[in-house]
């Protein structure tokens, strides 16, 4: 004969567990449903009544099936620095995440607590490594025969154009300036290749490393704090 | 708004059986997820959960206490009754009900009703 | 049975002034605590439920925190109306009582 399938609220057997999506409840010692994403336990269950569940209210959630007797909050708007990648729902939370030009300085469960600007590189500095979601731009000197005029978060170190003669020398951050009228292009950065001995590497002026990040980089606190994770929650 | 009333002997000797009423308003111990439990509280000393009862009748018991204590309703009128037998000058204390949410807290307390145990 | 471990037992403290309140079960409750005032002659008055949630009409200077074992509950801005007794209580397997603080102002 097959076993016969137990409703809840049921008493386990001795050392037994409770079925997936049931919880075993220490006061009415017995087993009981858990609520589905998106509602939360109204009322427990006792030892003849099952667990009687309520969708969550607006702005509140649960994600997983559950016996919270209240929804989580959703976190708070996001805030300028950073876009919605998620709206909150009853089954999920809002995630922020940070807007271009910005990375996630200090991360949370979901999302982003706290965005900062991306470091931009200063003229004589170019990006050693770029931004990503969770890590600010790395900025390097232009070594001999390369420069960056511009002040970025994205522009590399570019070589210096190759002059048959050169009227102003270029440095880490200004490109050489020709008399003639085709100059070329080195092929790889600070890989310098000279067809006449007029330019050389002694015109290439090595700049002194100086704090590479661009003034005015801004970090900007979140508006609350992010929501507690969801008691007890696992299937 | 829920009000909920104590009532009892007021003075009782030891061995007795105690027996109080609780009549309460606002609410219905026919509504699920609803219940009405006693607590007491000795004269300078803290509360103690002694019993409560269910909307469907599931009823729980302090353990140091379960096998003196009975609790019971009475739905239509509002009511329920809590029986403590053999009582001793322990006992004496005030003794207040107060209603369960259907997540387990006390909500709405009355105000007490005092028993002495005395010979 | 959960034991509720409640510390102070009493504590003075000034007008205007912030004290907190602890309870240690002894097991995980699972956030299921409760927080009541009572003062003589009344019932006890919910003040916070689920560790952290205000009973409504309850003042936010009143506040709750705590998971697993460990619970506080505070006052802030102390007025003559906030002495009393304060318990809290477990519900999470059973019900348990702290065993009380009673509050002084000076």
């Known amino acids: 004969l097959p076993a016969q399938v137990a409703f809840t609220p049921y008493a386990p057997e001795p050392g037994g567990t409770c079925r997936l999506r049931e919880y075993y409840d220490q006061t009415a010692q017995m087993c009981c449903s858990k609520c589905p994403p998106g509602q939360h336990a109204k009322v427990f269950c006792t030892k003849t009544s099952d667990t009687v569940c309520d969708s969550c209210e607006d702005s509140t959630y649960t994600q997983l099936w559950n016996w919270v007797p209240e929804c989580l909050s959703c976190g708070s708007r996001c805030s300028s620095d950073q876009v919605e990648t998620q709206a909150c729902t009853r089954e999920q939370n809002r995630i922020c995440t940070c807007r271009p030009g910005w990375y996630c300085a200090l991360s949370k469960q979901e999302g982003c607590r706290l965005c900062a600007q991306l470091r931009k590189c200063r003229p004589g500095f170019g990006v050693a490594r770029p931004g990503t979601e969770t890590s600010d731009v790395v900025c390097k000197p232009c070594a001999p025969g390369t420069f960056s005029n511009t002040t970025s978060s994205t522009d590399i170190c570019r070589p210096h154009q190759i002059c048959h003669v050169v009227a102003i020398p270029g440095n880490a951050s200004m490109d050489a300036v020709c008399t003639s009228t085709s100059p070329t292009r080195s092929m790889a950065p600070g890989a310098v290749h000279l067809p006449q001995p007029v330019s050389t590497r002694s015109q290439h002026t090595q700049p002194t490393p100086a704090p590479s990040t661009a003034p005015g980089t801004s970090f900007l606190l979140p508006v609350g704090p992010s929501p507690p994770a969801e008691g007890s929650t696992g299937d | 708004q829920v009000t909920l009333k104590e009532s009892g002997p007021g003075i009782l000797q030891p061995s007795q059986t105690l027996s109080l009423t609780c009549s309460f308003s606002?609410?219905?111990?026919?509504?699920?997820?609803?219940?009405v439990g006693w607590i007491r509280q000795p004269s300078g000393k803290g509360l103690e959960w002694l019993a409560h009862?269910?909307?469907?009748?599931?009823?729980f018991y302090n353990p140091s206490l379960k096998s003196q204590l009975t609790i019971s309703k009475d739905t239509s009128r509002n009511q329920v009754f809590l029986k403590l037998t053999s009582v001793v000058t322990a006992d004496t204390a005030t003794y207040y009900c107060?209603?369960?949410?259907?997540?387990?807290?006390?909500?709405?307390w009355g105000q007490g009703t005092t028993l002495t145990v005395s010979s | 049975d959960v034991q509720m471990t409640q510390s102070p037992s009493s504590l003075s403290a000034s007008l205007g002034g912030k004290v907190t309140i602890t309870c240690k079960a002894s097991?995980?409750?699972?956030?299921?605590i409760a927080w009541y005032q009572h003062k003589p002659g009344k019932g006890p008055r919910l003040l916070i439920h689920?560790?952290?949630t205000l009973q409504p009409g309850i003042p936010s200077k009143f506040s709750g925190s705590g998971s697993g074992r460990d619970y506080s509950f505070s006052i802030s801005n102390l007025e003559p109306e906030d002495i009393a007794t304060y318990y809290c209580l477990q519900y999470g397997n059973l019900w348990t009582f702290g065993g009380g603080t009673k509050l002084e102002i000076t």
């Open positions: 689920y560790t952290s």
């Open positions: 606002g609410f219905s111990l026919s509504t699920s997820g609803m219940g």
């Open positions: 097991q995980d409750i699972n956030k299921f």
């Open positions: 107060a209603r369960l949410t259907g997540t387990r807290y006390f909500d709405y």
């Open positions: 009862i269910w909307w469907d009748d599931d009823k």
